[in-house]
Interface confidence: low
């Protein structure tokens, strides 16, 4: 075969948000036989040749991007995309909020407010079933989360974290769950 | 609490042979890798040892390489360093301390020690 | 292996000071590097990690800085508890390394 060797897929089972003392397993999938996997830690020296890690319990210092690759005979294949691996729990919870309320009419405006004590600068929303965080464009890093035109679909369970954009990758505990009412759908 | 407690240290002749035992309670012992460290009377600190969370990898400093056996025992959250053919060199205090979970090598400062046992040779 | 060189061996200091130590890592190591504070017949005590992250129960007047391969361990005010000896270490690669250690006194 010329030229590199597709990338594998790296993903973290059952989440890449994990809990301080959590287990989670990385998972490095290729095509069928392959001769060699590896599996590295970005920015540090780590790295070991297998294609699944288990953590048995998350610790501080294992959160940040992870990649993998493969190699077939003497050729490498490219990177998988980065996975990026969170901590959670470093920190004590924020409180989240709906302004004006958590019951909201269909084709409203409701804003969620992620609250803490300390001097975060960054937060992020995740809506219960949704593997992403909620994201509105450049908002991303507020603690307001502005929802514009409510929908049946913004019904569900919220929760935010907070964390320091100077140690992304440290998140706190989740927030008490939030619970989004969306009426008159 | 947690803590580490250790036992087995003494004086022994060169060339004489000593188990240190390092009991841990208050954290999960088995999900943590663990570490001996030692200091030579007067002088600084310096790794000894390590071995995984599940015993499966074990690291050593050169000097003590091929005399020093770390261990464990996860169902009686227990550490072991055995020490044969023991020098005069090997004369210090030993302390065992948490490692972490970790990869193949290793992940997160020292924060959990024991106090310390003196091994004289 | 990756050597750990502390500087000063001995610092003599005064209640209130701000005090300062370096530690220079032969290759480098990230920011994998502990502060460890020891006290005579004490085990060593966790102050900073990750280079610059307080530990828990570290009192904030210390802090830490650098990456790659010089580090610096600060004490904002000198404290009385704090006369005793520091050690860096790199936890990037096996062997781990240590520091010879800074012993800070009392001027």
């Known amino acids: 075969q010329s030229g590199p060797l597709p990338k594998p897929s790296l993903q973290a089972l059952p989440s890449s948000l994990v809990p301080l003392e959590k287990p989670v397993t990385l998972r490095c999938q290729g095509p069928p036989g392959v001769d060699l996997y590896r599996l590295e830690k970005l920015s540090s020296s780590r790295y070991q040749d297998q294609a699944v890690l288990f953590i048995p319990a998350m610790k501080r210092s294992l959160a940040g991007r992870y990649r993998c690759s493969y190699q077939n005979g003497s050729l490498w294949s490219l990177p998988s995309d980065q996975l990026e691996l969170v901590a959670t729990g470093v920190f004590a919870k924020p409180s989240l909020s709906a302004q004006p309320g958590p019951a909201v009419s269909s084709g409203g405006d409701v804003t969620l407010q992620c609250q803490t004590r300390y001097g975060f600068d960054q937060f992020a929303l995740y809506k219960e079933g949704d593997p992403a965080p909620y994201k509105n464009p450049e908002r991303w890093y507020r603690a307001s989360f502005p929802i514009i035109t409510v929908t049946a679909a913004h019904s569900g369970t919220y929760r935010c974290y907070s964390f320091s954009s100077r140690d992304p990758y440290l998140w706190s505990a989740p927030s008490d769950p939030l619970e989004l009412v969306v009426t008159g759908t | 609490e947690v803590q580490l407690v250790q036992s087995g240290g003494g004086v022994v002749q060169p060339g004489g042979s000593l188990r240190l035992s390092c009991a841990a309670s208050?954290?999960?012992?088995?999900?943590?890798?663990m570490h001996w460290v030692r200091q030579a009377p007067g002088k600084g600190l310096e790794w000894v040892a390590f071995?995984?969370?599940?015993?499966?990898?074990?690291y050593y400093a050169d000097s003590v390489k091929g005399r020093f056996t770390i261990s464990r025992d996860n169902s009686k959250n227990t550490l072991y360093l055995q020490m044969n053919s023991l020098r005069a060199e090997d004369t210090a205090v030993y302390y065992c301390?948490?490692?972490?979970?970790?990869?193949?090598?290793?992940?997160?400062?020292?924060?959990?020690w024991g106090r310390g046992t003196m091994v004289t040779v | 292996d990756i050597q750990m060189t502390q500087s000063p061996s001995t610092l003599s200091a005064s209640i209130g000071d701000r005090v300062t130590i370096t530690c220079r890592a032969s290759?480098?190591?990230?920011?994998?590097l502990a502060w460890y504070q020891q006290k005579p017949g004490k085990a060593p005590k966790l102050l900073i990690y990750?280079?610059?992250s307080l530990a828990s129960g570290a009192p904030s007047r210390f802090s830490g800085s650098g990456s790659g391969t010089d580090f610096t361990l600060t004490i904002s005010s000198l404290q009385p508890d704090d006369f005793a000896t520091y050690y860096c270490?790199?936890?990037?690669?096996?062997?781990?390394?240590f520091g010879g250690g800074t012993k800070l006194e009392i001027k």
């Open positions: 290759e480098g190591i990230y920011h994998w």
């Open positions: 071995i995984r969370y599940d015993g499966s990898n074990k």
């Open positions: 301390t948490d490692g972490w979970a970790e990869m193949a090598t290793t992940d997160d400062a020292f924060d959990i």
């Open positions: 270490q790199q936890y990037s690669n096996y062997p781990l390394t």
């Open positions: 990750k280079a610059s």
């Open positions: 208050g954290f999960t012992f088995s999900s943590y890798g």
